[in-house]
């Protein structure tokens, strides 16, 4: 239950040093006074401490016109010191002056801590003009006080270029504790102390703290704040909350989850982007991390394929993004693909296999066996090889390319020509005569071109001259192509 | 080194009263609850209750309402248990521990036997 | 009340041996903790808040569960262990105690 302390007013303020009482004229000694007219400042001893000197809050007036007597001098009347209040209930103090007649113009402000109050402050100033004198009331309100209305208020009043200030009036709001820390959501290790800090403060004052566990009070005797809880240490999620009491009740902080970290759930949702013979881009939606940051992932690749070892291929890659393209994979060979993240707990269990292919690749090999020879009496170039020896990944042959290169004096030029899968043999027209014909074949498939053959030469000679033998590319392992003429 | 030193072994008459004091020292006494714990001959331990160290005020278990009162002396760190119109199944070792969080009672008095007999 | 149950309640075992009690609660509890005692002697703190060791408390004794069930462990029995343990709960008042298990010298 929350109970509400009986408003007091208290005579003292308590705030730090003393503060003087009464002023009276029999504490005051009148000082030499230039030739001026108007108020000058006093020096005045005060009498909760004798012998030291005080200023500020009276002024002395000089001799009056007709220079027979002393008006008192100028001061605030003491009222109380000290004003102690609940939370949203309304205050009004005030401070009153009597001010001689002579005197024109005063003006009244208020002020809060070293600070002149200004704008939409209810302040109100009454005079009440007597024959001599006018009793002048400064009246403060504030409704709804808060806890940011405590302060030390003074008036100051403006006689002649001079300044009277009142005694301070100390507000002192109280309420419900309230929270300058509260307890925050953590991801702890399991079986792992840490800690937890909760501070409040008043006024009233002292704040005691209670911790709050799952339901269940942690300390039955309370910690004055700002107290620091040790938890020995969760095998599981659990809810924090810290009381805060005082005089006024007590106050309940937010209450903040702790949750322990595990090892991330699989990734989910597997994809396959984009593959080529000896690649395959994949994503993956990550699981849940375990209250604990993912730090890499590790995409596990197995062959699918009878013949196989049954080996599986690991590449490791950062957890984001969340995509790896896997390279040094077979052509047109079948894989299965997983996923599995680790955060600072250890390695989430391995998402769903799926299934995912190559494509076809290039032949890695050259077409064997090349042979060119010149038919001059059709103006032609025939070329013949026996099919490479390629491997099924590389795909179904599609047909070959060939490379003619010509060359004479001060002129080259490189011509492509494709050719069907069928053929063993082609005929190019010659381009050149008095030149060098360099043939290169690559056999090609829907993966792309093979590797071209090692160059065949053969030499076109002006019309006329005709020489039947052939070039050729030699048989694996004999020396370097041989130009026959 | 925490120390909880209680007072000697009590022989006592059916009716009468007994007061069991345990002194506390090397740390700070108000800082920490203090429980007692009931273990009758031969049998195991009970929680009694305990009493906050920093505003007296005692809680007791059911079992424990009525006859039974915890009461402190700050000024020389000391607890005290007192028993009235005692019976004889109120025989028993009579524990004080120092209670911190979690209901922990990390260091124990050296018991004090309390013979209710006839 | 939480009602804590330890088993097993008598408990002859030799030195070196590796032995568990197990202290079952009537309903969830936040943690156990575990105390020994020697006969004529106070309880002394063992194990606080399921699994953590009080200070000067060999390491051959472990604590471990969530719940309702938790164990002590002791790895390898020692001459001074053989002694009463007893289990007792926090996370509900009033603080319970388990009925205490009896470990004795094979």
């Known amino acids: 239950a929350i109970t509400e302390a009986r408003e007091e007013a208290k005579p003292y303020p308590l705030f730090p040093g003393p503060l003087p009482g009464s002023l009276q004229t029999d504490h005051t000694s009148l000082l030499s006074l230039p030739h001026t007219s108007g108020y000058q400042p006093a020096l005045m001893f005060s009498p909760t401490q004798p012998g030291r000197p005080y200023t500020g809050n009276v002024a002395i007036p000089r001799v009056t016109s007709a220079g027979s007597k002393l008006l008192p001098p100028l001061a605030f009347k003491h009222t109380v010191g000290h004003i102690i209040l609940s939370e949203h209930k309304d205050v009004k103090f005030n401070c009153s002056i009597s001010v001689p007649n002579i005197y024109q113009d005063t003006t009244i402000s208020w002020w809060k801590d070293g600070k002149e109050l200004l704008g939409a402050h209810h302040a109100i100033t009454q005079f009440y003009p007597d024959d001599e004198v006018t009793a002048i009331i400064a009246s403060f309100s504030i409704t709804s006080v808060q806890r940011s209305d405590n302060g030390s208020y003074i008036c100051k009043m403006k006689i002649n270029n001079e300044e009277i200030v009142s005694d301070p009036i100390y507000i002192e709001v109280q309420g419900l504790p309230h929270f300058t820390k509260q307890p925050e959501s953590m991801n702890v290790t399991r079986n792992t102390a840490f800690n937890l800090t909760c501070q409040a403060v008043g006024p009233p004052e002292p704040v005691n703290i209670f911790w709050v566990q799952n339901s269940s009070r942690v300390n039955e005797q309370p910690e004055k704040s700002p107290s620091v809880l040790t938890v020995p240490g969760l095998t599981e999620m659990a809810v924090f909350s810290c009381e805060a009491h005082n005089d006024k009740g007590l106050t309940v902080s937010k209450g903040v989850q702790i949750n322990i970290k595990a090892i991330p759930s699989p990734p989910t949702e597997v994809s396959i982007h984009n593959s080529t013979a000896h690649s395959i881009l994949i994503s993956w939606v990550p699981g849940f991390d375990g209250y604990s940051p993912f730090r890499n992932c590790s995409v596990q690749v197995k062959e699918v394929d009878p013949l196989s070892n049954g080996s599986v291929m690991i590449f490791n890659t950062s957890a984001s993004p969340h995509m790896y393209q896997i390279k040094q994979l077979q052509a047109l060979a079948n894989y299965s693909i997983g996923v599995s993240c680790m955060n600072e707990i250890g390695w989430s269990a391995v998402s769903p296999w799926i299934l995912a292919s190559t494509t076809e690749g290039a032949p890695s090999v050259a077409p064997l066996n090349v042979t060119v020879f010149l038919n001059e009496s059709r103006d032609n170039v025939d070329i013949r090889w026996m099919k490479p020896l390629t491997k099924r990944q590389a795909g179904e042959l599609v047909g070959y390319r060939i490379s003619h290169v010509w060359q004479s004096a001060g002129i080259s030029k490189e011509l492509l020509e494709e050719v069907g899968q069928n053929n063993s043999r082609a005929q190019i027209s010659v381009q050149v005569h008095n030149a060098t014909c360099t043939v290169r074949i690559a056999a090609v498939t829907k993966g792309g071109v093979g590797p071209f053959s090692d160059p065949v030469k053969i030499f076109i000679p002006a019309h006329g001259w005709v020489d039947h033998a052939p070039s050729s590319t030699p048989a694996p392992g004999n020396a370097d192509p041989v130009l026959i003429i | 080194q925490v120390q909880l030193v209680q007072s000697g072994s009590e022989l006592k008459k059916p009716g009468a009263s007994v007061k069991v004091s345990c002194k506390a020292s090397?740390?700070?006494?108000?800082?920490?609850?203090m429980s007692w714990v009931r273990q009758a001959p031969g049998q195991g331990l009970e929680w009694m209750g305990w009493?906050?160290?920093?505003?007296?005020?005692?809680t007791y278990t059911d079992d424990f309402k009525g006859r039974f009162v915890f009461s402190l002396d700050t000024s020389v760190s000391t607890a005290y248990l007192q028993i009235s119109s005692l019976k004889a199944e109120d025989t028993a070792v009579y524990y004080c521990?120092?209670?911190?969080?979690?209901?922990?009672?990390?260091?124990w008095g050296q018991g004090t036997l309390v013979t209710v007999s006839s | 009340d939480i009602q804590l149950t330890q088993s097993p309640g008598f408990l002859s075992a030799s030195v070196g041996d590796r032995v568990t009690i197990t202290c079952r609660a009537s309903?969830?509890?936040?943690?156990m903790h575990w105390y020994q005692q020697k006969p004529g002697k106070a309880p002394k703190l063992l194990i606080y808040?399921?699994?953590n060791l009080a200070q000067g408390v060999p390491s051959r004794f472990s604590g471990s569960g969530s719940g309702t069930e938790f164990t002590l462990t002791i790895s390898s029995l020692q001459p001074e262990d053989f002694a009463t343990y007893y289990c007792?709960?926090?996370?509900?008042?009033?603080?319970?105690f388990g009925q205490g298990t009896k470990l004795e010298i094979k």
């Open positions: 521990a120092r209670y911190t969080n979690y209901g922990v009672f990390d260091y």
């Open positions: 090397s740390y700070t006494f108000t800082t920490y609850g």
């Open positions: 009493i906050n160290t920093m505003s007296g005020v005692p």
């Open positions: 309903s969830s509890v936040g943690y």
């Open positions: 808040a399921t699994s």
């Open positions: 007792q709960q926090w996370g509900s008042l009033p603080f319970t």
